[in-house]
């Protein structure tokens, strides 16, 4: 705390407030008998700025000129010392260093719709660090004038409280803004406008959609908007989407037709109002319309596919598989699929309507001609049916592609690759690749999957529902009219040893030699296409090596016989399998005597 | 922000004296300077003098000597003794305070009190 100034005076010139840059002189004087006993030659006045001694002087004052003072306070105080005494403090001063306003840049007015009032933004420049004062001024017609004042140290906003009308919307107006402070002024270069530069338009409001007949192709926008309005701009998108459609249209008068809207597609619509061509500015954005355009009937048709199992000599059971639409060929919400069987012969004919599954299954006799359509049925009609004669796909040997193999491609991807038929490749109409997952016991539940390529291809990636560690069995088709030829193969996209060997079930004695029974591994062990088993075999007790039969692996291959055993010896024997990563562990160990004669 | 009121103005001889004041209340914290300006017809305003909280004064070289500026920092006043007046002094005196508002100042004005020095 500094103490009011009983021992003497500060005085400060120009101000206490000082331009940035500019110098300040700063008097200390003692009042009369105020200085140190006996010896007023000896006072000695020191001047401190904040804690550090600036200045010093021997006698009754004490006169110093500082410069170089930065933006906001700086505190000085003055000080008498004495002779064996300390330093007694006399009186104080704060300078407080500001800046003159800049111009002020960029002056723009605007007014809110026809009906708001007009308001001006500027840009202040640099921070003065003082009380500014900032005066609007707006001059028009017939020496009209309005002005508006603020005091405060950030402003860049004024609003008259004035509306301009439209009666003469040719006349200028001009706006000025001048900021004023302690140390000095500053005015903007003057904004000439008028009415229809100034006027932003309030943003559309009311926005409504009709679709008549409810069709998407007769679509109307509706909205509203003030009374002056000349151009409108919509915009509009697929929710789902980040691109905008723009229009601009002129003398709308509240409604628009839309004619590239899809059909079942949530849209999201927005419109934007000038009162001029090239004069004043776009209303902000309305709120968005969201909307969904109504349903159309279904375009496209769809992919089916078939598998054929044999049942007994007089039936077959037909599985139909078929994949959804897109969503632009569905246009709508799929409610059934019309499934249709026919025998061609007899006229025969079966239609069935199928909710939820994209697959269904039947028996057929095995004689006669047979044919099905598939269509996809939403609320405003059906697709074209997809018409397939059912045949025997792989019926047609020298129509079988050739060299077929199947190899991992990167991340649950396989390429499989192919060579053409024999018979003349220019037959083939189209190839079909299908895969499933291989179940030993063939299970027809298994998911299908299958892709269509183009008769000069071959080569497809398969990428579709395909997982690491899983052997699918593969399937190429080659189609030629009513003929088909197919070739198959084994594959997986990443693999390693299976985690486990395959458990023998049982070991029998059949005419000196032995038949072993084996437990398929579970799928989710095998850990990709299972390549070979090995069985090995030693004498119990025995150090010696074992011995070992490699099988190479086939699906339905539960057995083998081994003819190599000593008869009247007990065996030790164990079995594994491999896929192309490498071999299991162990599985059981059985142990066996052969009981029959010694050759 | 500060509301400052002033009082004393009148019509006074040439020679004579006059002591304005003006009282600072609302959120008076703070309050850096305190000053006069002064104001005659068709003249822009102009400083008389200031004093800042810790004493410290500045006096326009027109009045330097005839005017003391004094404050009482625990009432917010300050006083303004105008001796050995002239009739050019005569003018609208306005009472100024300047308050700390972060690291700028923000500056409050009276409406100002007559002071008509006659010949």
């Known amino acids: 705390k500094i103490d009011a100034c009983k021992r003497g005076d500060v005085t400060v010139k120009p101000s206490h407030v000082i331009l940035l840059g500019s110098t300040v002189n700063i008097t200390c004087s003692l009042k009369p008998r105020q200085g140190c006993f006996h010896y007023s030659r000896r006072n000695k006045l020191i001047l401190y700025k904040f804690d550090r001694r600036i200045n010093f002087h021997h006698g009754h004052s004490l006169n110093s000129q500082v410069t170089g003072l930065p933006l906001g306070t700086t505190l000085f105080v003055c000080k008498l010392a004495c002779i064996n005494s300390d330093e007694i403090q006399i009186c104080g001063a704060e300078i407080f260093v500001g800046v003159a306003p800049e111009q002020p840049q960029n002056l723009s007015c605007i007014q809110k719709g026809e009906q708001g009032t007009v308001a001006c933004t500027w840009e202040r420049g640099r921070d003065t660090h003082l009380y500014t004062e900032y005066t609007l001024q707006l001059s028009g017609p017939k020496n009209l004038t309005w002005q508006k004042q603020c005091k405060d140290i950030y402003c860049d906003y004024l609003d008259f409280g004035i509306n301009l009308t439209p009666e003469s919307p040719e006349s200028n107006f001009t706006a000025k803004v001048t900021a004023v402070n302690s140390l000095g002024s500053s005015s903007s270069l003057p904004s000439t406008f008028t009415f229809l530069d100034i006027v932003r338009p309030l943003p559309p409001w009311d926005i409504r959609i009709k679709f008549q007949k409810a069709s998407v192709s007769r679509c109307t926008l509706y909205w509203r908007d003030e009374g002056l309005v000349l151009l409108n701009r919509l915009r509009y998108r697929p929710s789902n989407s980040r691109l905008w459609n723009m229009v601009n249209v002129t003398k709308a008068k509240g409604r628009h037709d839309l004619l590239d809207l899809k059909p079942f597609t949530e849209y999201e619509f927005q419109i934007s109002s000038k009162l001029h061509l090239y004069k004043g500015s776009w209303s902000d954005w309305s709120e968005s319309l969201r909307a969904q355009t109504p349903e159309e009937e279904p375009t496209g048709m769809l992919d089916v596919w078939y598998m054929k199992r044999h049942i007994d000599y007089s039936r077959q059971q037909i599985s139909l598989f078929w994949k959804n639409l897109s969503v632009s060929e569905a246009r709508g919400k799929i409610l059934h699929y019309q499934v249709t069987l026919q025998e061609l012969t007899g006229g025969k004919a079966m239609t069935q309507n199928i909710t939820g599954h994209t697959s269904w299954t039947t028996v057929i006799p095995r004689t006669g001609n047979w044919a099905v359509a598939v269509s996809a049925a939403n609320s405003k009609g059906s697709s074209l049916p997809t018409r397939i004669n059912i045949m025997n796909l792989c019926e047609a040997g020298l129509l079988a592609p050739r060299q077929v193999s199947a190899n991992s491609e990167g991340m649950d991807n396989i390429l499989v690759t192919w060579q053409p038929p024999r018979k003349d490749p220019s037959a083939v109409q189209e190839y079909v690749v299908e895969w499933r997952e291989l179940h030993p016991g063939g299970d027809t539940q298994v998911p299908l999957n299958w892709l269509r390529s183009r008769p000069y291809n071959v080569s497809a990636l398969i990428s579709e529902n395909i997982k690491s560690y899983i052997c699918y069995e593969i399937r190429v088709y080659a189609l030629s009219g009513d003929q088909g030829g197919c070739s198959s193969i084994l594959g997986n996209s990443k693999h390693k040893a299976p985690l486990s060997g395959p458990h023998i079930n049982a070991i029998t004695e059949e005419k000196g030699s032995i038949l072993i029974s084996w437990n398929s591994i579970p799928v989710q062990e095998q850990m990709g296409c299972l390549l070979h088993y090995r069985i090995y075999w030693k004498e119990r007790d025995s150090n010696s090596q074992p011995q070992l039969c490699e099988i190479p692996y086939r699906v339905s291959q539960n057995s083998h016989p081994i003819n190599s055993l000593q008869p009247r010896v007990t065996y030790v024997l164990w079995m594994t399998a491999l896929t192309a990563a490498g071999e299991s562990s162990h599985g059981n160990e059985r142990e066996f005597c052969l009981q029959g004669k010694a050759n | 922000q500060v509301q400052l009121q002033e009082s004393g103005g009148g019509l006074v001889q040439a020679g004579g004296s006059l002591v304005l004041s003006c009282a600072a209340s609302?959120?008076?914290?703070?309050?850096?300077?305190m000053s006069w300006y002064r104001q005659a017809p068709g003249k822009q305003r102009e400083l008389v003098a200031e004093?800042?909280?810790?004493?410290?004064?500045t006096y326009a070289d027109s009045v330097e000597g005839r005017f003391t500026i004094s404050r009482d920092n625990a009432k917010n006043i300050v006083d303004l003794q105008m001796n050995s007046l002239k009739p050019e002094d005569t003018a609208v005196y306005y009472c100024?305070?300047?308050?700390?508002?972060?690291?700028?100042?923000?500056?409050?004005w009276g409406r100002g009190t007559q002071v008509t020095v006659s010949s």
């Open positions: 100024k305070a300047d308050q700390y508002y972060g690291d700028s100042l923000r500056s409050s």
């Open positions: 609302g959120s008076a914290a703070l309050i850096f300077l």
């Open positions: 004093v800042s909280r810790y004493g410290s004064t």
